[in-house]
Amino acid sequence: HTAAQDNCTCPTNKMTVCSPDGPGGRCQCRALGSGMAVDCSTLTSKCLLLKARMSAPKNARTLVRPSEHALVDNDGLYDPDCDPEGRFKARQCNQTSVCWCVNSVGVRRTDKGDLSLRCDELVRTHHILIDLRHRPTAGAFNHSDLDAELRRLFRERYRLHPKFVAAVHYEQPTIQIELRQNTSQKAAGDVDIGDAAYYFERDIKGESLFQGRGGLDLRVRGEPLQVERTLIYYLDEIPPKFSMKRLT
Amino acid sequence: HTAAQDNCTCPTNKMTVCSPDGPGGRCQCRALGSGMAVDCSTLTSKCLLLKARMSAPKNARTLVRPSEHALVDNDGLYDPDCDPEGRFKARQCNQTSVCWCVNSVGVRRTDKGDLSLRCDELVRTHHILIDLRHRPTAGAFNHSDLDAELRRLFRERYRLHPKFVAAVHYEQPTIQIELRQNTSQKAAGDVDIGDAAYYFERDIKGESLFQGRGGLDLRVRGEPLQVERTLIYYLDEIPPKFSMKRLT
């Protein structure tokens, strides 16, 4: 697996441990948390990244650790089970034997149940809508410049084939990026739209997953584009199954 | 209720309609959504603000409207029921007769049920932990300067009495602001910690609720402090009641 030879690091994933113990003394990198070997010439799967994130040592000793009774609106962080290819297993369970089904981006798509819950297949998220709001600027960005810049970003930084960026919509200050990728369209070696969206989300939050590439610096004709709010919507090939109770 | 007399606007709440029809032709402002009169010399309650937010016309016509099957991690936005004082009613229900109990900041604190669900009292959130991560800077901020600046901000911008800012913790790049306010401590006219935290949260997101006061501009000894991630934990006087299924 390609990794920076001389100093043996993984350019596409800083949440790795690398050593020159691959075939012929080649640099090999393993994801934290799972210990799985990763290909450093492309993005690491979201499942392995989440697992690494949950395994990272929590240092902040002098800070307050919220009580177990604290309420917070944050459903998306958990320690996932990944399959041998690094994809999310269709069924995820926690330590207290509560289980639920997820889609290919690891987002829950059923009510929670017990160990008897069955998730027959990993349902593919084939359409991702990234909804951003940018900070105020002197004027609106030029739509076609913005479109070109975001397509370039997804191609260069996240290695996502341009055909998977279906559209870029803009109505100041809202930008929407539509990623589409059916099971049939995704060829071997293609970056998954879910992984590209996750890297982008972490970049926007200033939590870049890349090693030594600096943070995301988004500019349209030299003008910085600073994002102040992000919402990501995931659409699955098969609609999710929730009871009425979810519909608030 | 105090409002800017001559141009009749509400400095503390832009989600209002104001007209000079108060006693003696004084400017009176009513919250959008509820039509309730608000006091423009202090913060408007979070319940009325959420109600106004949900009633605001959605314009963005050319943008994609996510399908009803789209998954998004965002549980905190709903159209609430507020009491005559503008506080959250203890029980909230949606159009499909799904009900749940909330705390004084409007965050769900029980599993969802049906119309038979009882919420005996509005449980007070007496401790709020605001967990921020700031953008990288040349060096760490001086802790006491940061502490003083955040206390000043809460006092000046949100009119929160300094005694309710219990502590400011800092371990670069994480900042934690602890707000504490028991039922017994809160006197008439005191700003509620939940309202102050909500205004702060909206300010951080670049969605200031103030009229004519500019966005939030946070500085420590002149150095801009830019927040890139916020998590808010709410602790209630009585712990929340969730079934085991919540514990993921």
């Epitope: - | 400095p11 000046e156 006061r213 500019g214 939030l216 501009d217």
Partner: antibody, heavy 121, light 107 residues
Framework: QIQLVQSGPELKKPGETVKISCKAS????????MNWVKQAPGKGLKWMGW????????TYAEEFKGRFAFSLETSASTAYLQINNLKKEDTATYFC??????????????WGAGTTVTVSS | DIVMTQSHKFMSTSVGDRVSITCKAS??????VAWYQQKPGQSPKVLIY???YRYTGVPDRFTGSGSGTDFTFTISRVQAEDLAVYYC?????????FGAGTKLELK
Amino acid sequence: QIQLVQSGPELKKPGETVKISCKASGYTFTNYGMNWVKQAPGKGLKWMGWINTKTGEPTYAEEFKGRFAFSLETSASTAYLQINNLKKEDTATYFCGRGGYGSSYWYFDVWGAGTTVTVSS
Amino acid sequence: DIVMTQSHKFMSTSVGDRVSITCKASQDVSIAVAWYQQKPGQSPKVLIYSASYRYTGVPDRFTGSGSGTDFTFTISRVQAEDLAVYYCQQHYITPLTFGAGTKLELK
């Protein structure tokens, strides 16, 4: 050190135009807004408005809408105040003042020395 | 617009005296009030912001207090170099407004 250097005094006739400059040094220009304050001879201070140095967006106080224009040359860390169709009542000292982007910092911690504009026929 | 009223146009004092200047806002401005000192032929200089916060390098004989609509600026022991005009300013909401000024002079 941090300073705002303003252009020199101006003597103009009614109906003419004047453009005053305010050059900032010693700090990141775009980290602060630039305010303009008028002081007529023997009178108090009057806020004219401010310009957002990040976006170039000006905000004018009601009294100064129309003939007054704020502008920037960001690459030169310079703000400008232009007054068109000068009137006798525009005779005053004009100060630029550094301030923040929100009300918590809408006081002026650094001031220029002032530019005196005299309008006389 | 918010009107800032400084009740005294002039105040007479002696070196070593304690002097207080008041400023009243026409509506509640939280604690968003600054105080400036201006000497003849000079630009104003900020002394206090947010009602009671002393600006960097300002001597501790200068203090401020108040909230809502009533504000006070105090010099605990007047020195000869303190003779100047003092202005209050609300930094709560635009348009930003100043008081008319209070001139501190020797008795």
